[in-house]
């Protein structure tokens, strides 16, 4: 017992005065606490504790049970103990079952010992299995042997205590060891789509998927900037130990345009937390945006290609797409395909592919787009430019030499005069009246320019060019005069 | 050996609230799973919610969640569960039972706390 | 959620006869399927677990088998004590238990 000097309060002193005792099951326990001052004595095994406030410690018939610690205390709070096994062959381990571990913990497998002086006190596993090669305990017969570090991968290990009690091993109850796991990452998070967009009264759902080693990860959806509680539905699945799913779908039955924004799915353990975020869009009504790929206004020669491309954005789905020439519908040199193949995707592509064009083919073709909302087109003017044509040179009756052409861009009409046999006509020669035909015809397809110039003007003989050209080419017809005397004997045109 | 100890029997107005307790006598509470689950008069048993204490958040049933609170308690080993919003179909065995998240089985039950909602 | 479906909702049988108690899951919980017994005022008592693990102190007439979405309860001999009913229960999704199949005395 304690010794302590005078005038200082001394714990208690026990009878018998030993650490230890040992008691035959069917004996008599008897303890004494010599104290003036005591208060009680307490009886702890398995975590299960008795009082009694006599100062005498009596049981007639000792049971494995009352195998434990006896502690008395006195009014200072001082206290002594002693230890006592009450030995039962039949009953060599106190058991409580239940056997939880925290990973990377000890966990304590609770088998005290009813008799000390067995021997090989150790664990051992069910149905005469190894335990794994990993697994360290240490044994104490006052408590039960506790298990190091313990791992996940001891998760459902079935085991019992073991001892040597006169030559025969003695088994316990089975326990069956259940690991708590550690985090040791953030939750992993995803969401179903990172963006959505409604009309006004139609339903958001979006589902958030958590995945963990436990079901107790934290998790819920909230909306950015706002403490109001979204309702949200769970499902949840374990696909193995330590493999935990969740979805959590959130829900708005019937959006509305204020509903828009950022939604976010968070997630958190005792490691730390992960969060996704997906957008809401909500829009009154559905709409179409288009945007032409190349200019409107579209110039080209004539026999070439040209491909009018777009780009529309249309929500919801468009349903209807159409090219349109002179009110006539394109079956086919069209397509019209997704921008992405992605889920929410809104953009489209449309393309129409006019090949060799002609100079008749000018005009206005027109892409025409709707959905269940709304109705766009886009209208492309396109102009073929064509090399000047020469459709009529004549010698009018009033002396007048005419040269009409038709070309796009607008032609010009120059006139030469060549003396002579000379090929080459340098002298020009001003034009009496030039104007344009078709100026208000349509506003598409080649442009008809007429220019007239006086032959009285011609004194010698030669030829008179006409040439008409624009941007793209040129193209000459020729009058060639003849004098016999003093007339005019001939005029002959030719290009 | 572990024991659940249940509070007493509880008679309630619909609307009201009950809170039940469950208190673990011995062996490793933090680490335990305790889960509540009820059982109306003459029906089968119905899982509400857990939870582990080490880990601190709990776990619900999707037809409680939002009215079901659970909670635990490690410095008195006890675990709680707190019903609102109270209506007659509320009426039943309410149990605690060790075991029931994480794949753990129901090995150890307390003995049921008896909640009559009448107006 | 997952259902647990329970055949037959009870049976009549007599000392000694050999039971079996049926459960269907709705879809596949692996072996994350455990069987319990209750008796009329008092609290559910743990059988099985992991769908044929017996529970220590159960008596070995018990046994489960079973794994995916279709298991059974065997009571080779039935005794007095095992007239009672009989719940089985998921542990994969939120958990569920069958609607109980009531034993009783023939």
């Known amino acids: 017992q304690p010794s302590v000097s005078p005038g200082e309060p001394s714990p208690p002193s026990i009878h018998p005065a030993k650490s230890e005792l040992i008691v035959r099951v069917g004996n008599e326990i008897r303890l004494l606490c010599i104290d003036p001052g005591f208060v009680k004595w307490t009886f702890e095994i398995l975590d299960e504790t008795n009082e009694n406030k006599q100062n005498e410690w009596i049981t007639e018939k000792a049971e494995a049970t009352n195998t434990g610690k006896y502690t008395c205390t006195n009014k200072h709070g001082l206290s002594s103990s002693i230890y006592v096994f009450v030995r039962d062959p039949a009953k060599l381990f106190l058991v409580d079952r239940s056997l939880y571990g925290k990973e990377d913990n000890d966990t304590l497998v609770r088998c005290p010992l009813t008799d000390p002086e067995v021997t090989s006190y150790s664990l051992k596993g069910c149905q005469g299995k190894p335990l794994p090669k990993d697994l360290r305990f240490v044994p104490d017969p006052k408590a039960g042997i506790t298990i190091k570090s313990v791992k996940r991968a001891y998760h459902r290990l079935c085991l019992h205590c073991s001892a040597d009690q006169e030559g025969k091993s003695v088994l316990s109850d089975k326990f069956i060891l259940k690991v708590r796991p550690a985090f040791k990452a953030v939750p992993v998070v995803s969401v179903s789509k990172a963006s959505y967009l409604l009309r006004e009264g139609e339903e958001f759902t979006v589902t958030c998927t958590i995945k963990d080693v436990s079901s107790s990860v934290y998790s819920t959806w909230k909306r950015e900037n706002s403490q109001t509680k979204l309702q949200e539905k769970y499902n949840s699945w374990h696909h193995g130990d330590f493999n935990y799913e969740r979805q959590a779908t959130l829900t708005i039955s019937s959006a509305r345009v204020n509903d828009s924004g950022v939604f976010m799915c968070y997630a958190n353990n005792t490691f730390g937390s992960a969060n996704v975020t997906t957008t809401l869009e909500v829009v009154d009504k559905g709409f179409i945006n288009i945007f032409p790929m190349i200019n409107t206004t579209v110039f080209v020669n004539d026999g070439e290609n040209v491909d009018l491309i777009v780009e529309y954005e249309a929500f919801p789905k468009p349903e209807h797409q159409q090219w349109i020439y002179m009110n006539r519908t394109f079956t086919d040199k069209w397509e019209d395909y997704p921008k992405s193949e992605n889920e929410s995707n809104i953009r489209y592509v449309s393309e129409l592919h006019l090949t060799r064009l002609k100079g008749t083919e000018g005009g206005t073709y027109t892409f025409l787009v709707s959905n269940s909302d709304v109705n766009a087109s886009i209208a492309f003017n396109v102009y073929v430019n064509t090399k000047p044509e020469i459709l009529t040179y004549d010698r009018l009756v009033n002396g007048m030499l005419q040269c009409v052409a038709a070309g796009f861009p607008e032609p010009t009409i120059d006139w030469y005069f060549c003396p002579g046999t000379e090929q080459r006509c340098s002298a020009s020669v001003l034009p009496v009246d030039v104007q344009t035909l078709n100026a208000s015809g349509p506003p598409f397809g080649k442009l008809v320019v007429q220019s007239s110039i006086d032959s009285s003007a011609f004194k010698h003989n030669g030829t008179v060019e006409c040439k008409a050209y624009n941007d793209v080419g040129k193209t000459s017809a020729y009058f060639n005069f003849a004098f016999k005397g003093n007339n005019k004997e001939q005029i002959h045109p030719h290009t | 050996q572990v024991q659940l100890v249940q509070s007493g029997a509880e008679v309630k107005k619909p609307g009201s609230s009950v809170k039940v307790s469950c208190k673990a006598s011995g062996g490793t509470f933090s680490s335990y799973a305790i889960s509540w689950v009820r059982q109306a008069p003459g029906q089968g048993l119905e899982w509400m919610g857990g939870?582990?204490?080490?880990?601190?958040?709990?776990n619900y049933a999707q037809k409680f969640q939002g009215r079901v609170t659970i909670t635990a308690d490690e410095s008195t080993s006890t675990a709680y569960m707190e019903l609102s919003s109270l209506r007659s179909e509320d009426t039943a065995v309410y149990y605690c039972a060790r075991g029931g998240l994480d794949t753990d089985e129901f090995d150890l039950w307390g003995r049921g706390t008896l909640v009559t909602v009448s107006s | 959620d997952i259902q647990m479906t329970q055949s037959p909702s009870s049976l009549s049988a007599s000392v000694g006869d050999r039971v079996t108690i049926t459960c269907r899951a709705s879809q596949s919980i692996n072996s994350y399927l455990n069987w319990y017994q209750q008796k009329p005022g008092k609290a559910p008592k743990l059988l099985i677990y992991?769908?044929?693990s017996l529970q220590s102190g159960v008596p070995s007439r018990f046994s489960g088998s079973g794994s995916g979405t279709d298991f059974t309860l065997t009571i080779s001999s039935l005794q007095p004590e095992d007239f009672a009913t009989y719940y089985c229960?998921?542990?994969?999704?939120?958990?569920?238990f069958g609607g109980g199949t009531k034993v009783e005395i023939k």
């Open positions: 229960q998921q542990g994969v999704s939120d958990i569920t």
């Open positions: 992991a769908a044929s």
């Open positions: 939870i582990i204490p080490i880990f601190g958040t709990a």
